[in-house]
């Protein structure tokens, strides 16, 4: 189990410290009132190119 | 066989302390968030409080939070809630519950309930 | 704060009989609705979670539906030892749950 502070989530999921654990951001899109939503907000879940013309 | 044993309850003196226990035996503690609930004589049933299973997140209901404190010891396989400054109407049934095991999203098991009576 | 609103408070109903049970919330919470059954004395017991999924060693004559703001507990067939009181719980906002004032369901 990974503890706060150490290597971060893997793409497109993010701590819960209520759950103590990596949670999926898609979850998010149902349920945004938990704690781990936060954190998914500030990365993008997953990568994007800008593409110009 | 999971159970869970809750102690502690009693008669209290308005603005007086108890401290409850929930044993917990048959499963793994440590990996599960638990919470307390109670339950007023004759009426429904009452989040009080919940803490992740490290116990380094807590949350509480605004009827207890500054008076009541929820804790717990994962070597000990025990969940605690210390309550102070006790008033009348925290007279009650106070169970202690597991939340699953993926979210929690449900409470599968539950203690019997210990009894607190708030009363002069 | 979402608020859980369950429809009857109370019922009469006999053995064998098919027993309806309302749940609103306050607002949309989704599938997040579990369902508990509670007798004199005793602890609350989880049946239905998730809206529609039976909890392990749940008889199947219990069952449960409905999504957004309205849900139904349905008993297929009222056995004796069914008369209890039901509550609804929403964990849409978990960890900060409520429940419904329940449903108390007695023998006619």
């Known amino acids: 189990e990974q503890a706060p502070g150490t290597a971060p989530c893997s793409r497109g999921s993010s701590w819960s410290a209520d759950l103590d654990k990596c949670m999926d951001c898609a979850s998010c899109r149902a349920r945004p009132h938990s704690d781990f939503c936060l954190g998914c907000a500030a990365a993008p879940p997953a990568p994007f190119r800008l593409l110009w013309p | 066989e999971v159970q869970l044993l809750e102690s502690g309850g009693g008669l209290v003196q308005p603005g007086g302390s108890l401290r409850l226990s929930c044993a917990a035996s048959?499963?793994?503690?440590?990996?599960?968030?638990m919470i307390w609930v109670r339950q007023a004589p004759g009426k429904g049933l009452e989040w009080v409080s919940y803490i992740s299973p490290s116990g380094g997140s807590t949350h509480y209901a605004d009827s207890v939070k500054g008076r009541f404190t929820i804790s717990r010891d994962n070597s000990k396989n025990t969940l605690y809630l210390q309550m102070n400054s006790l008033r009348a109407e925290d007279t009650a049934v106070y169970y202690c519950a597991r939340g699953g095991d993926t979210y929690f999203d449900y409470f599968d098991y539950w203690g019997q309930g210990t009894l607190v009576t708030v009363s002069s | 704060d979402i608020q859980m609103t369950q429809s009857p408070s109370s019922l009469s109903a006999s053995v064998g009989d098919r027993v309806t049970i309302t749940c609103r919330a306050s607002?949309?919470?989704?599938?997040?609705l579990n369902w508990y059954q509670q007798k004199p004395g005793k602890a609350p017991k989880l049946l239905i979670y998730?809206?529609?999924s039976l909890q392990s060693g749940v008889p199947s004559r219990f069952s449960g539906s409905g999504s957004g703001t309205d849900f139904t507990l349905t008993i297929s067939s009222l056995q004796p030892e069914d008369f209890a009181t039901y509550y609804c719980?929403?964990?849409?906002?978990?960890?900060?749950?409520?429940f419904g004032q329940g449903t108390k369901v007695e023998i006619k």
């Open positions: 607002q949309s919470i989704s599938g997040y």
């Open positions: 998730q809206a529609s």
């Open positions: 719980q929403q964990s849409y906002t978990s960890p900060f749950i409520t």
């Open positions: 048959g499963f793994t503690f440590s990996p599960y968030p």
